[in-house]
């Protein structure tokens, strides 16, 4: 069963740059998971209200 | 998501062709830009990818000592340079961008001739 | 690199009919996370080419129904049922695994 969230292709293992990339099926396309601090749509900047 | 090209060039065989393509509706940041390459009655290859976030870019073998991808994200654009151009690079380029390329240039055609 | 080979170089069909396009991969596109990573264009004469089926099977946004892909890891086949006029051009797989990205040489689709 395929989830609606799962691990990126190879190709995009540096697509987020603070956190973690996950495909969403549904859209058919990569997405980024920030990790605490980081905000945008790749992650790309530091949450200055964290 | 449009994406608009630049427009035709006529070049001498040993010079050099920038071409552009320029997003609207759209940060160029946000994604990877792709460029592909298309001989006169022939297929589509993939030239490579550029990442306008940072400039990291990925070729293909075959283009990699001849293409050069940079972007400029002021502007929204992305760029491909082509050198020492020969007949073989006669060609139509296209840019398009998104996971899976859902989104095409209208293309720009390049021909090499003296 | 993945070798993609689309062994028709062209296929006539006369509108109203049904027509498959297939296409090989020289390695998996089956993902580890369940995906298979083959998409399907068509390129009209004198236009970008248009995407009309994502990870073998999904058919894109505006992409009207009569287009159908399935396949396993290694070969596919995009099938197009009730063709009509403006179904004709050159449709092309890619394998959007890993770099670097490559298409199958194309089959065009020729009306009788």
């Known amino acids: 069963v395929v989830s609606h969230f799962n691990d990126c292709p190879d190709s995009h293992t540096q697509f987020c740059f603070h956190g973690t990339c996950r495909f969403l099926v549904q859209e058919d396309k990569p997405a980024c998971v920030c990790a605490s601090g980081y905000v945008g749509a790749r992650c790309e900047h530091a949450d200055l209200l964290a | 998501v449009q994406l608009q090209q630049s427009g035709a060039e006529l070049v001498r065989p040993g010079a050099s062709v920038k071409l552009s393509c320029t997003a609207s509706?759209?940060?160029?940041?946000?994604?990877?830009m792709h460029w592909m390459k298309q001989r006169p009655e022939q297929g589509l290859e993939w030239i490579g990818r550029i990442d306008p976030a940072n400039g990291n870019t990925k070729y293909a073998p075959k283009f990699q000592d001849k293409a050069t991808m940079t972007a400029d994200t002021s502007s929204n654009t992305a760029y491909l340079q082509f050198s020492s151009l020969t007949s073989e690079d006669t060609a139509v380029y296209y840019c398009?961008?998104?996971?899976?390329?859902?989104?095409w240039g209208q293309g720009t055609l390049v021909t090499v001739s003296a | 690199d993945i070798v993609m080979t689309q062994a028709a170089p062209s296929v006539p069909v006369t509108p109203g009919e049904s027509v498959s396009i297939s296409c090989r991969s020289s390695?998996?596109?089956?993902?580890?996370?369940?995906?298979?990573?083959l998409y399907w264009f068509l390129q009209r004469p004198g236009q970008s080419p248009q995407l009309l089926i994502y990870r073998m099977s999904n058919l894109a946004s505006g992409v009207p129904d009569r287009f159908s892909g399935s396949g396993s890891g290694t070969a596919f086949t995009l099938r197009i049922s009730r063709v009509e006029a403006e179904d004709v051009g050159v449709y092309y797989c890619l394998q959007h695994l890993e770099y670097p990205y490559t298409f199958g040489s194309g089959t065009k689709l020729e009306i009788k």
């Open positions: 509706d759209f940060n160029i940041k946000d994604d990877y």
């Open positions: 390695k998996s596109l089956l993902h580890r996370n369940g995906n298979t990573y």
């Open positions: 398009a961008t998104s996971w899976g390329f859902p989104y």
